[in-house]
């Protein structure tokens, strides 16, 4: 018998959708050859209609697609705009039609529903409000309105225009009478359940004169989108639930056991701690809509997903929603990278952001992940030469290593740098990043004396002393700008004496100015890296001031001013909040973005976690 | 919460037909896969078939074992489903149980329903 295993019978409407999915034991090669869908003749032949090589016949033009998921050991075949002419026996199968490896399908395409005459067919989704019309003549005007639900054989009161209300319909009906003019009455459901639908009744007077109207109400689930996206990537989920619950808390959930949808976050404030440092709601426009961005896919994040509203900020009955599966793809094109960097109060970090190779030349971000309200993330720095005020000289941003890899560099920590930050491009939306950076005890690795104060026209040498575990790397002295660190002449000086217990292979490498000008003050950084991997790095500013005595200066750590107190953020940073995920140049795929570098409060984002990895602070 | 109660199980001759119901009961909220299952003595759980309703079609699955002899039916509005049993054979006895799923995803044969019935005794002689 065959291993492929499908739905042996699929029956469906005229204009209807299906949506067929097929079994298939998830072997190598099970999940590489071709997956078809093909219509059995009267001879026994098996005609293709769509394959997974990118055929779809002509037949199935505009309104087919078929799609692997090789994870699952599944692939599905959409089918849109059916006619009756679809009805049929079909196999969804691999590799060659005339092959065993196959499963027979019939499909039955029917008419629909029979409708008594005269009946007005209302299609509306689940959660959402239907507004029953009911035309009376004027002999009927002053005479009672209802309306019923054929329940089996008999008519069940639903509403009438003497105040009753079936307890089923309590707190979310109401009979509306127009006004004299109009022979119209109408009644209006709102937070539509599944069992609201069927056939309804009604009628204006109660004797033979009386005037009644046949309804019909279809009320739909909603159809689950499949999305499909990397582990390590991200997701956008975009909700559009319609200016009626514009005011009203959204969710956004995830559907557990049975009935349970766990809420993921919500606009009331709450987020899952699974989520922590990898999400933003993004806030809703005029029109309801709102979307939420996930980033470093997880295996366990895999699951149907809806939005909705309710004064709650969770889901109940009634409530209108969209739903989603989302699949999580594990053969990920997103490299693993670190989601943990770790640094010592006063040291640094050096963190390595992954991007699409094919898109070297788009901009790059690193932002400062916010929980408050539905989550933000301020913007610190960009590849274009962007630095936050608060970061000047302690961070830098570098297209180092290249090839779908940057590093972003942040020194002179403090126990207020610890978060998640996220890298993002302006490019692709799915490669959104995450690390979480964690201070811990510790002492810097690199010893540099704190601020420097420089004589104009004389010569200064700054000493960093470097211990023995960096004795295979290189080390150098640059010069932070706002654009990188740019390389500086140095000198090594044999072993350091600032470090116990450490032997010939510590080095103090010292960084000399030589006729010091204006143009050298700032900061300087002294740091190791492996080719055009980044290590560890200390920063020192330069100070430059008119001459007072002659001579040479010579900083030892001694003399080291104290470190400058850290700079409070102010409030007019960039940041990339929740208006950011409509920042087309980051969250959405059709428009490009104006420069924000100019903007005072500019928008960006993005994000990963993934694997459980951590980085040392010290060293990648 | 949601219950399902399984009936119409019964003592049956070899060749001869029996129909199952299941109903469920409580908030059902978006039941959107019913299935059959079966436990004969001594042996594992084993899938039977599944009703899956979505986006207005439906979806009906069967076992190897009993396909051409079993039926699948259901009224997703009422979320009942019943499974009419002809031709039935001796290795047909075991335990039938309902069991309801909330999402139209996942392979039906397999054990990710959210609830299951208490299960039903069908025996068939020879």
């Known amino acids: 018998k065959s291993p492929i295993f499908g739905p042996e019978e699929v029956n469906s409407v005229e204009g209807n959708s299906v949506s067929i999915t097929c079994y298939y034991p998830p072997t190598s090669v099970n999940r590489h050859t071709r997956k078809y869908w093909c219509r059995q003749g009267a001879r026994g032949g098996c005609i293709t209609l769509i394959s997974s090589e990118g055929y779809v016949s002509s037949k199935y033009a505009g309104r087919a697609n078929l799609t692997n998921f090789p994870e699952n050991g599944t692939f599905v075949v959409n089918i849109a705009q059916l006619s009756q002419d679809d009805s049929g026996r079909y196999k969804c199968g691999l590799g060659i039609n005339s092959r065993g490896l196959s499963f027979d399908v019939s499909l039955e395409v029917s008419q629909g529903p029979g409708l008594l005459n005269d009946t007005k067919v209302y299609t509306v989704d689940l959660g959402r409000t239907v507004t029953i019309n009911c035309p009376f003549k004027t002999e009927n005007a002053q005479k009672r309105k209802s309306l019923y639900k054929q329940i089996g054989l008999y008519p069940v009161l639903v509403i009438d225009s003497s105040g009753y209300v079936n307890p089923n319909y309590t707190g979310r009906i109401r009979l509306d009478i127009q006004g004299t003019g109009q022979l119209l009455f109408s009644v209006v459901i709102n937070q539509l359940r599944l069992s609201d639908a069927g056939q309804y009744l009604c009628q204006a007077g109660d004797d033979s004169n009386s005037n009644k109207k046949n309804a019909d109400l279809q009320v739909l689930k909603p159809e689950p989108e499949l999305v499909y996206e990397d582990l390590r990537g991200s997701v956008t989920f975009h909700c559009a639930l319609g200016p009626e619950v514009a005011n009203v808390a959204k969710f956004l959930c995830r559907q557990s056991s049975g009935e349970n949808c766990d809420v993921v976050v919500n606009t009331l404030g709450k987020r899952a701690p699974a989520f922590e440092g990898r999400i933003l709601l993004n806030p809703q426009d005029k029109d309801g809509s709102f979307s939420v961005v996930i980033t470093g896919l997880r295996k366990e994040d895999a699951g149907r997903y809806l939005c909705g509203a309710h004064s709650d900020g969770q889901l109940q009955e009634g409530s209108p929603i969209q739903a989603w599966q989302l699949f999580v793809n594990e053969e990920s094109t997103i490299p693993r990278s670190p989601t943990v960097v770790k640094g010592v109060a006063g040291g640094s970090v050096a963190v390595l952001c992954p991007y699409n190779r094919k898109e070297s030349k788009s901009i790059k971000y690193w932002c400062l992940w916010e929980g408050a309200q539905n989550g933000r993330c301020p913007l610190l720095v960009d590849s274009e030469g962007w630095v936050k005020a608060q970061y000047e000289g302690r961070l830098s941003l570098l297209e180092e290593p290249g090839n779908g890899t940057f590093t972003v560099i942040l020194n002179q920590l403090t126990s207020r740098d610890a978060g998640f930050y996220w890298c993002l491009t302006n490019g692709d939306t799915l490669w959104r990043t995450t690390v979480e950076i964690k201070i811990i005890e510790g002492e810097p690795n690199l010893k540099v004396p704190g601020n420097v104060t420089a004589v104009l026209g004389e010569t200064l040498k700054v000493p960093c002393h470097f211990p023995c575990k960096f004795s295979s790397y290189e080390k150098y002295w640059c010069k932070w700008n706002n654009t990188g660190c740019q390389a500086l002449p140095s000198q090594d000086e044999g072993p350091s004496k600032a470090f116990v217990n450490c032997d010939e292979n510590s080095r103090l490498v010292s960084l000399t100015l030589n006729l010091v000008t204006r143009a050298d003050e700032g900061w300087y950084w002294c740091g190791v890296k492996q080719g055009h991997f980044y290590g560890e790095t200390a920063a020192v500013y330069v100070a430059v001031e008119e001459r007072k005595a002659a001579g040479s200066r010579d900083v030892s750590l001694a003399k080291a001013d104290a470190a400058p107190d850290e700079k409070v953020l102010d409030s007019g940073f960039r940041e990339i909040e929740n208006k950011a995920i409509q920042d087309p140049r980051l969250f959405a795929e059709e428009k490009a973005v104006a420069d924000t570098r100019d903007q005072a409060d500019g928008s960006r984002a993005s994000v990963d976690s993934g694997s459980s990895e951590e980085q040392g602070g010290s060293s990648r | 919460q949601v219950q399902l109660v399984e009936s119409g199980g019964g003592l049956v001759q070899a060749g001869g037909s029996l129909r199952l119901s299941c109903a469920a009961s409580?908030?059902?909220?978006?039941?959107?896969?019913m299935g059959w299952f079966r436990q004969a003595p001594g042996k594992e759980r084993e899938f039977v078939t599944a009703?899956?309703?979505?986006?207005?079609?439906?979806?009906?699955y069967y076992a190897d074992s009993v396909k051409g002899r079993f039926t699948i039916s259901g009224d997703n509005a009422r979320n009942t489903v019943d499974l009419q049993m002809n031709s039935l054979k001796p290795e047909d006895t075991a335990v039938y149980y309902c069991?309801?799923?909330?999402?139209?995803?996942?392979?039906?044969?397999?054990?990710?329903?959210?609830?299951w019935g208490q299960g039903t005794l069908v025996t068939v002689s020879s």
């Open positions: 409580g908030r059902a909220f978006s039941q959107y896969t």
């Open positions: 009703i899956r309703w979505s986006g207005g079609s439906i979806y009906k």
């Open positions: 069991a309801a799923r909330m999402s139209p995803w996942g392979d039906p044969r397999g054990n990710e329903y959210d609830y």
